[in-house]
């Protein structure tokens, strides 16, 4: 069966939107009005992995682009990147672990934990216009809580 996907945008708990920053990076900033069109639309695919009531494994692709968020070691540090894939083979139900995030719902907020690196989360900073990254703490000054807005296909 084909993998189930939905289109959505994400905003952090400070209401910062996610936009492209160069060809292989995302950044977070406050957008208003027409600028909202800049925000990236994700194709969130529901993939194979450990699942529970509040934890669902997903892959986060960029809609109509052959780019997926992935988690890899760079200089011995878990790092978030946008990785180019062959569109003929993706998305798929059994995604490589680096592409998988555990979508965790807590109090109507979402966290995205790396399946490859447990306790590392998609994060933004308090500062404006700075990259989205993989952070190793929750509840500190880095932001790990997001809301999801559905986008019609």
């Amino acid at each position: 069966a084909p993998v189930r996907s939905l289109n959505c945008t994400l905003r952090d708990s400070q209401q910062k939107s996610l936009v492209m920053s160069g060809p292989y990076e995302l950044k977070a900033l406050h957008l208003q009005g027409q600028d909202m069109e800049q925000q990236v639309v994700f194709s969130m695919s529901f993939v194979q992995g450990e699942e529970s009531n509040d934890k669902i494994p997903v892959a986060l692709g960029l809609k109509e682009k052959n780019l997926y968020l992935s988690c890899v070691l760079k200089d011995d540090k878990p790092t978030l990147q946008l990785e180019s894939v062959d569109p003929k083979n993706y998305p798929k139900k059994k995604m490589e672990k680096r592409f998988v995030f555990n979508k965790i719902e807590i109090n109507n907020k979402l966290e995205f934990e790396s399946a490859q690196f447990p306790n590392w989360y998609i994060s933004t900073s308090q500062a404006e216009n700075m990259p989205v990254f993989l952070g190793g703490t929750k509840g500190g000054q880095d932001i790990t809580d997001f809301t999801m807005q559905f986008v019609s296909s």
């Epitope: 404006e128 216009n129 000054q141």
Partner: antibody, heavy 118, light 107 residues
Amino acid sequence: EVQLLESGGGLVQPGGSLRLSCAASGFTFSKYFMFWVRQAPGKGLEWVSVISPSGYMTRYADSVKGRFTISRDNSKNTLYLQMNSLRAEDTAVYYCARVGYGGNSDYWGQGTLVTVSS
Amino acid sequence: DIQMTQSPSSVSASVGDRLTIICRASQDINRWLAWYQQTPGNAPKLLIHSATSLQSGVPSRFSGSGSGTDFTLTINSLQPEDFATYYCQQADSFPLTFGGGTKVEIK
């Protein structure tokens, strides 16, 4: 008053290492992104590296990637730049700078000179 | 990487002149542009951020304009302390990049 004071520069042979420090005061260091920016003698400004307040997010210029490492100790209000495999073209004044709104450098240190020569 | 091109690279002017420096980005950087002033032997000083916002404490004779790829720094009525080198810097994406600088000399 915001103050940034770099130290650790000096003369080093090609292939050698240096560790620069930047002592910060007059603001809540742990809340700010920080940059290293360099300026070769008689040349323009070149951005080198950035680190987030928590230290989890770092980025580097291609010219130093794999050789330089930025880090910070928020308990000591200090920013660091570990420089390995130094080359003649790394000769420059190295400035640390506090990152202001949206990615500008709103306060700068006085700089420390690194000379790579045999 | 985004290339930043400044013009002119140097200019001679007199006290009281109105001076315009141009900075062009190789791609759209929205309004994520800063301007700095540097005098010999000193660290750069932030003048303008977000293309048009005057940094606190900077005299109002300095102003910035533009968005997208084309930006200008204007100095109305040059003062003796304004003879320096000016740099633009894009903050749209990493790696951050600076223009090559514009040296303003006394005529």
